[in-house]
């Protein structure tokens, strides 16, 4: 939930030309959805995993990183069609023979249960109910994430009316 903005104590009539600082806000950019402390963007188009990774970078974000089962469930609750799939920021590292998040950390065995092969060129996607591995060349939707940002808005009191 976004924090509510407290009532302004400024006397608007007496300070009509004065610029006032608004309280700090935790904001997601337009079109992004706030989920806990993250902003998520669900793509409307499809791409292979690498292109999805690159697209998130251009948006100053990353492919979704999921910390635990609770976060997985919260994200899956936003997927409204059982058949639709979204790439996340997890793929198989052949050199380390393990699932690796794009931030460099490895998948902990109790984080996510992945259905499918753990092999070269395997990337992970989520659906409404499950987590799967698939060839990274498969073209699917994807989810970008960015951390909530503090926005300090300087606005004229007129704009509050």
């Amino acid at each position: 939930q976004k924090p509510s903005i407290g009532k302004c104590s400024v006397d608007i009539q007496q300070n009509r030309t004065k610029t006032t600082e608004r309280p700090d806000l935790l904001n997601c950019p337009i079109y992004w959805q706030q989920v806990q402390e993250k902003c998520l963007l669900f793509s409307h188009t499809v791409n292979p995993w690498n292109n999805s990774l690159a697209d998130c970078s251009t948006k100053e974000s990353s492919l979704l990183l999921i910390q635990d089962k609770d976060e997985l469930t919260r994200t899956q609750n936003l997927i409204h069609d059982k058949a639709i799939s979204f790439w996340i920021g997890l793929n198989f590292s052949l050199s380390e023979k393990n699932w690796k998040w794009i931030n460099g950390s490895f998948l902990s065995s109790n984080d996510l249960k992945i259905t499918g092969d753990a092999k070269e060129n395997s990337c992970v996607y989520i659906s409404q109910t499950s987590v799967y591995s698939e060839y990274c060349s498969t073209e699917m939707k994807w989810i970008c994430q960015k951390e909530l940002t503090l926005v300090r808005n300087k606005v004229s009191p007129d704009s509050w009316l």
């Epitope: 058949a83 639709i84 799939s85 996607y125 799967y132 698939e134 060839y135 498969t138 073209e139 699917m140």
Partner: antibody
Amino acid sequence: QVQLVESGGGLVKPGGSLRLSCAASGFTFSQYYMSWIRQAPGKGLEWVSYISPSGATIAYADSVKGRFTISRDNAKNSLYLQMNSLRAEDTAVYYCARSLMATGTHLYFDLWGRGTLVTVSS
Amino acid sequence: DIQLTQSPSSVSASVGDRVTITCRASQGISSWLAWYQQKPGKAPKLLIYAAESLQSGVPSRFSGSGSGTDFTLTISSLQPEDFATYYCQQVTSQPPYTFGGGTKVEIK
């Protein structure tokens, strides 16, 4: 109007070639996996081939591998099937079909053309 | 390749009847299954995807269930326009995407 329209079917001799086309309209063609599915007279359905939205990934049924080639032109909203070395058992109605968007290679065919008949006979 | 066996191959029923068609996969396919309806001379129409999700525009008298190897399509109250042939299809991520042999629903 969202639709698929196949063309290019006809009568061809064994060993001959044919090129089928499928014109898509009413949706963003470049975002969908597309397939060819066929149905021999009085028989069931057989998936033939698919192509990914960008055209980078392609797959074929064993029965047509090495003889058929699927392709697409996203600028023209068109899907193609080049059929070479045709056999009598390739005789069928050939359907162009779109998959539900964003299901990856889990191909649920939610939009079909009316089909075009290919007859291979001497 | 994964084989799909549909039963029965044909069924005679009357308007208002409850009709059940089964589809059995030769190996587990999770919920990667679709059901189609086909009328003579027409293209198939997607009814159910992901084993139980109703495709947009399909009447609610159609329902799907099952996972793993055993799946069911149910028509709760058969209507005149439902007389057709029904096919199941497995859609695991690797081809070939096989179809069942079909079940013809005929008027009794």
